[in-house]
Amino acid sequence: MMTGTIETTGNISAEKGGSIILQCHLSSTTAQVTQVNWEQQDQLLAICNADLGWHISPSFKDRVAPGPGLGLTLQSLTVNDTGEYFCIYHTYPDGTYTGRIFLEVLESSVAEHGARFQIP
């Protein structure tokens, strides 16, 4: 039975040209996290594997940095980066947990972080 929950940074906004940290946290389970995948729609951004370390997809190497922790830092943001991002936790024995973050990249300097929320 999957008892864990993923807490994410929720709906967030950031300025064009700036950077943002995408963060998820898995709680309420003793399952072992073997890998976390970061995806944007159907595109793989990055992998953090417990044994292998990090892998950044070649097309994102210049704008994506690993961490902090299991999170992901997006740099040199453009309006095209607006959209849904997913953290996919591969765990044993539970299976897969998925968290969703919506990022809005703004032209103006008015960019505020949204509230945190949980996804079961």
Epitope: A50, L52, G53, Y92
Partner: antibody
Framework: EVQLVESGGGLVQPGGSLRLSCAAS????????MNWVRQAPGKGLEWVSY???????NYADSVKGRFTISRDNAKNSLYLQMNSLRAEDTAVYYC???????????????WGQGTMVTVSS | DIVMTQSPDSLAVSLGERATINCKSS????????????LAWYQQKPGQPPKLLIY???TRESGVPDRFSGSGSGTDFTLTISSLQAEDVAVYYC????????FGGGTKVEIK
């Protein structure tokens, strides 16, 4: 004695296929993450593929879409199915075990003797 | 990928003398959350597979003689053989695993 023994190497034409096997003994195979690492003749080492104890899989970009890693814990065996082989895949292929520690050291602690794969027409 | 650059490519050392091998990574391999450097050293003798000597940059693997030691942090690392023995003739590789694993090009150690 902890041991890994590879087999299945040989000469294959470009575009051909080969399946490598690695037989493990002397340890609880199902508890360990396993890898394939290759070494071209006279060259350095290149990590190829990984499979965790729970089945999570990763590949080097150079083999993604062509190679498939799998394991059979009941048979204490690791496999690498290699398709669409190229001349640059010519190498000794080693299976290697990930070291287990209190926190992951991310190092390969046990290696097999290797099996040679030659891709040539 | 992180590029691992070893130097020198080869070195000849007299028996009983010190051998020093350097490894430089193109990015830091220090993981701040646990303060560990994900850097390992391997020894490969002719016709044999690699053998793990050191992990976390400075922790010796069980059974490895204490004449082998590793040091360094961030991007610059060193493997030292304090008193070279005949059986130490081999190629030595560093490997990072902050990102998916990559290896240095190797350093060949011979007897002078």
């Amino acid at each position: 004695e902890v041991q890994l023994v590879e087999s299945g190497g040989g000469l294959v034409q470009p575009g051909g296929s080969l399946r490598l096997s690695c037989a493990a003994s002397g340890f609880t195979f199902s508890s360990y993450s396993m890898n394939w690492v290759r070494q071209a003749p006279g060259k350095g080492l290149e990590w190829v593929s990984y499979i965790s104890s729970s089945g999570t899989i990763n590949y080097a970009d150079s083999v993604k879409g062509r190679f498939t890693i799998s394991r059979d814990n009941a048979k204490n065996s690791l496999y690498l199915q290699m398709n669409s082989l190229r001349a640059e895949d010519t190498a000794v292929y080693y299976c290697a075990r990930h070291r287990i520690a209190d926190s992951p050291s991310r190092a390969f602690d046990i290696w097999g003797q290797g099996t040679m794969v030659t891709v040539s027409s | 990928d992180i590029v691992m650059t070893q130097s020198p490519d080869s070195l000849a050392v007299s028996l009983g003398e010190r051998a020093t091998i350097n490894c430089k990574s193109s990015q830091s391999v220090l993981f701040s959350s646990n303060n560990k450097n994900y850097l390992a050293w391997y020894q490969q003798k002719p016709g044999q597979p690699p053998k793990l000597l050191i992990y976390w940059a400075s922790t010796r693997e069980s059974g490895v003689p204490d004449r082998f030691s590793g040091s360094g942090s961030g991007t610059d690392f060193t493997l030292t053989i304090s008193s070279l023995q005949a059986e130490d003739v081999a190629v030595y590789y560093c490997q990072q695993s902050y990102f998916f694993p990559t290896f240095g090009g190797g350093t060949k150690v011979e007897i002078k």
